[in-house]
Structure formats: C-alpha cells, structure tokens
C-alpha cells in the first residue's frame, strides 16, 4: 500500500469516476467516527488489487453503491 502512515483518515484524494462493479474486488464504506470525521469509500479493484478512494458525494458513486447493494441483496437469501 503506498504511503502507509498513522493518520485519522485514509484518503488523501478522491475520485468522482464511476467504477465498473464487475471490476470490483471489494467496496469498503468506512463511516465517520471519532478518528475521521467523514465517510470514506475505498474500492479495491480486481486488477493488481489497486485501491481507490471514491467521492461519497458524487452522483456516479452513489449510483455505484446502489448497484452494489442491489447485487448483494440478490445474492443473500
């Protein structure tokens, strides 16, 4: 992981660019806490395991979250 260090939050920069759900290995949503006062969304890509910080306020990212949660609810009985 690049630039690992002890900080309250994880993301230095964020992206508005949508991610193809099929290329996602994992999507982490870290809620605001006493350590970091903002929501952070970290997408782990299948290719190379690259991790990206996504903008929680972006419409495209909100749509991605909806798509992923829909997919998850389909899978769960």
């Amino acid at each position: 992981v690049p630039l690992s260090r002890t900080v309250r939050c994880t993301c230095i920069s964020i992206s508005n660019q949508p991610v193809n759900p099929r290329s996602l290995e994992k999507l982490e949503i870290i809620p605001a806490s006493q350590f970091c006062p903002r929501v952070e969304i970290i997408a782990t890509m299948k290719k190379k395991g690259e991790k990206r910080c996504l903008n929680p306020e972006s419409k495209a990212i909100k749509n991605l979250l909806k798509a992923v949660s829909k997919e998850r609810s389909k899978r769960s009985p």
Epitope: P2, L3, R8, T10, C11, S13, I14, S15, N16, R52
Partner: antibody
Framework: QVQLVESGGGVVQPGRSLRLSCAAS????????MHWVRQAPGKGLEWVAV????????YYADSVKGRFTISRDNSKNTLYLQINSLRAEDTAVYYC????????????????WGQGTLVTVSS | DIQMTQSPSSLSASVGDRVTITCRAS??????LAWYQQKPEKAPKSLIY???SLQSGVPSRFSGSGSGTDFTLTISSLQPEDFATYYC?????????FGGGTKVEIK
C-alpha cells in the same frame, strides 16, 4: 488544462515568516490532495508537505515540522504554505504539485507541477 | 527514510542513442516509483508512475521497468528535447524521497 500558479516568494531575513500561495485551475481542486516540493539552487528535489482534499490530514518532512504549515481554501481553489522561523537552508524554489489522485492513501507521486516561486533567506 | 540512488549522475549522449538510467532504493518499494524530467529553470514534469505506467501525453520512447529495489528508465531513441535532468522518486512510504538526479547532456 491543469494550471498551478505559485506566488508569495521573495527575499526575507532569517527568523522572519512568509506565506506562499498556489492558485489552482483546470481540475477538481476540492477532490485532490496537494503537495509542496522544494528545490535549493543547483540541488535536487525535496518533498515538503501534503494536505488531503478537505484539509483534515497534513503531513510534513522532518526538516520543516513545527515551522511550516500547509493549508487550503477549497472555495478559492488555493493552496498555502506558511513558513515561520526562516533559515538559510530554506532558500529554494517552492513548487506546488497535484497528487495523482485515485490511489488509496493518495499516491504520493505528482501529476502536475506549478512553475515555482523562489524564496531567498538572507540577511 | 528510504534512500534513492540514481546512476549515473550525468551522461553524454547523441540524438538517436538509447539511454538507460538506473535507480536503486535502500529497501523494497514494490512498484511505487515515479520518474520526472526537469529542464533548466522549469518545473519537473511527470513521465512515469507505478514504475512502468506512462503519464498521459508522454512519448512512447520513454519506458520504465523494475520492482522491489532496482528500477530503470529507458529512452529508446534520444531526441533533442530530451536533454534534461531526470529524477526517480519512491512513494512506498513517507516521506516521499527523490534520487539525486541524472543530467543527460549532448555529446
């Protein structure tokens, strides 16, 4: 296109203070981590500080910790570097640079650089 | 801090030459390495990131390779505009650190 324009440099006496600015345009400043990197005359590049996209995280080189403060105003698309207790060894061209942007933790490599502003510390 | 050692510190070459610059990290940095080009009195310009990914708009004669501790920047056919100083930089861990630079001069 991406543009970064630094200002605020000049000749200043040891022990004094200075505030550098970097006006950004051509990209989504409020999404981007930003860095300051400096270069002493005839020398190589030295990373100085980083600030995250909304100003929560700041991180500094040991050589400037406690004397330099990085900050930003996203409403003005402007990055700042407050330099206190200036020393002769702070004489350098100071560049602001954009963070690459999509990597977890920020990548720490730099996409775009400003033209730089020269700070000369001399009595 | 991770030390970055570049070699050579300077080299003379002719237009059309193949030029290779090496960079060694004092400890493993995976592929978290970038290369920059700097011309006199100008700001550095990003050439390569993640050891081998070409920055948008950079000519394909530039290429990067390596991982772990040993890295290479290659210019396949040197052009007049390539005479400059080249820096490597690691971003595996804070603080980001640069090599001392390699000045490519006209033979």
């Amino acid at each position: 296109q991406v543009q970064l324009v630094e200002s605020g440099g000049g000749v200043v006496q040891p022990g004094r203070s200075l505030r550098l600015s970097c006006a950004a345009s051509g990209f989504t400043f409020s999404n981007s981590g930003m860095h300051w990197v400096r270069q002493a005359p005839g020398k190589g590049l030295e990373w100085v500080a980083v600030i995250d996209y909304d100003g929560i995280i700041q991180y500094y080189a040991d050589s400037v910790k406690g004397r330099f403060t990085i900050s930003r105003d996203n409403s003005k698309n402007t990055l700042y570097l407050q330099i206190n207790s200036l020393r002769a060894e702070d004489t350098a061209v100071y560049y602001c640079a954009t963070e690459r942007g999509t990597h977890y933790y920020g990548s720490g490599s730099f996409d775009y650089w400003g033209q730089g502003t020269l700070v000369t510390v001399s009595s | 801090d991770i030390q970055m050692t570049q070699s050579p510190s300077s080299l003379s070459a002719s237009v059309g030459d193949r030029v290779t610059i090496t960079c060694r990290a004092s400890q493993g940095i995976s592929s978290w390495l970038a290369w920059y080009q700097q011309k006199p009195e100008k700001a550095p310009k990003s050439l390569i990131y993640a050891a081998s990914s070409l920055q948008s708009g950079v000519p394909s004669r530039f290429s990067g390779s390596g991982s772990g501790t040993d890295f290479t920047l290659t210019i396949s056919s040197l052009q007049p505009e390539d005479f400059a100083t080249y820096y490597c930089q690691q971003y595996n861990s804070y603080p980001p650190t640069f090599g001392g630079g390699t000045k490519v001069e006209i033979k």
